[in-house]
């Protein structure tokens, strides 16, 4: 059974992940971003289901294309280089989803834009955080 300290740690990690994803979304949505149109042509896979921490496997599998798109943006709106931002997210995701179980991610048939993709995972984080608090 999860202890209050492990629940608190999970909550803090989710809040950190949420902030990183929101920072990326804000950087992309910035009205001064001239590459937004091009960025929206890149398609991302959306999870069929995202209700548990193990479903973060679906986010982990999309970090590689996310990094590519962020490199394309080369935006001053991000405080960190894409490499470091993605590294941070990767570390949090690995800790949250755990490495004990191998979960096969299932994706929805329809692909999404980077904005839709980020919004989906932001909603996921907010939803899990709300169940923990």
């Amino acid at each position: 059974a999860p202890t209050s300290s492990s629940t608190k740690k999970t909550q803090l990690q989710l809040e950190h992940l949420l902030l990183d994803l929101q920072m990326i979304l804000n950087g992309i949505n910035n009205y001064k971003n001239p590459k937004l149109t091009r960025m929206l042509t890149f398609k991302f896979y959306m999870p069929k289901k995202a209700t548990e921490l193990k479903h973060l496997q679906c986010l982990e599998e999309e970090l590689k294309p996310l990094e590519e798109v962020l490199n394309l943006a080369q935006s001053k709106n991000f405080h960190l280089r894409p490499r470091d931002l993605i590294s941070n997210i990767n570390v949090i995701v690995l800790e949250l989803k755990g490495s004990e179980t191998t979960f096969m991610c299932e994706y929805a048939d329809e692909t999404a834009t980077i904005v839709e993709f980020l919004n989906r995972w932001i909603t996921f984080c907010q939803s899990i955080i709300s169940t923990l608090t």
């Epitope: 398609k43 590689k64 294309p65 590519e68 490199n71 280089r81 894409p82 990767n90 994706y107």
Partner: antibody
Framework: QVQLVQSGPEVKKPGASVKVSCKAS????????ISWVRRAPGQGLEWMGW????????NYAQKLQGRVTMTTDTSTSTAYMELRSLRSDDTAVYYC??????????????????WGQGTLVTVSS | DIQLTQSPSTLSASVGDRVTISCRAS??????LAWYQHRPGQAPKLLIY???SLQSGVPSRFSGSGSGTDFTLTISSLQPEDFATYYC?????????FGPGTTVDIR
């Protein structure tokens, strides 16, 4: 100019291990990732895995997971690929290759623009 | 894993012919698709990346097109040195995968 020079051919027995080296020159070694690709006789190209020369981050093909280890030695600008528990179907020409895009990648771009000359590894009893 | 299929597996053509090779992915990969040429006894050579970007130094008779799951490599006028095996590769998601290859031989 960019060069990737690989170690010479190897003949190994089933169950043994092989370690292929790949010495890079002509560019900043730590700014690019290295992929390993092989081609078995009569087969197509098979992606084996990738290593970041910047931070040692690796990604391996699922079918080789547990048998393959990729490493780098930044002091000598050399990449290594070790394959263990060799089987006869591991007989192939092994290539090291450099990423097209550079420094900013955590995951590697995946596009390969420079290749080593290839190392033939023969697994036979 | 993302699977790639190529067609045809073998193609017989003559010098000067226009040649088209298809590559289909099991899931959307655009624009993360590359094309390589592999001649016997040599290392593979990058021709096209990002589905349609011509690699520096590659002749303009080579071109790439497509998006989503369907991609095409076109050689507008086949030259003697173009007889080789051609592979598509997706680099969208790990593990990166190659297609089975299309061998272009002399008719």
């Amino acid at each position: 100019q960019v060069q990737l020079v690989q170690s010479g051919p190897e003949v190994k027995k089933p169950g043994a291990s092989v370690k292929v080296s790949c010495k890079a020159s002509g560019y900043t070694f730590t700014s690019y990732g290295i992929s390993w690709v092989r081609r078995a006789p009569g087969q197509g190209l098979e992606w084996m895995g990738w290593i970041s020369a910047y931070n040692g981050n690796t990604n391996y093909a699922q079918k080789l997971q547990g048998r393959v280890t990729m490493t780098t030695d930044t002091s000598t600008s050399t990449a290594y690929m070790e394959l263990r528990s060799l089987r006869s179907d591991d007989t192939a020409v092994y290539y090291c290759a450099r990423d097209l895009q550079s420094p900013t990648y955590y995951y590697g771009s995946g596009v390969i623009d420079y290749w080593g000359q290839g190392t033939l590894v023969t697994v036979s009893s | 894993d993302i699977q790639l299929t190529q067609s045809p597996s073998t193609l017989s053509a003559s010098v000067g012919d226009r040649v088209t090779i298809s590559c289909r992915a099991s899931r959307a990969v655009s624009p993360w698709l590359a094309w390589y040429q592999h001649r016997p006894g040599q290392a593979p050579k990058l021709l096209i990346y990002a589905a349609s970007s011509l690699q520096s130094g590659v002749p303009s008779r080579f071109s790439g097109s497509g998006s989503g799951t369907d991609f095409t490599l076109t050689i507008s006028s086949l030259q003697p040195e173009d007889f080789a095996t051609y592979y598509c590769q997706q680099y969208r998601s790990y593990p990166f995968t190659f297609g089975p290859g299309t061998t272009v031989d002399i008719r």
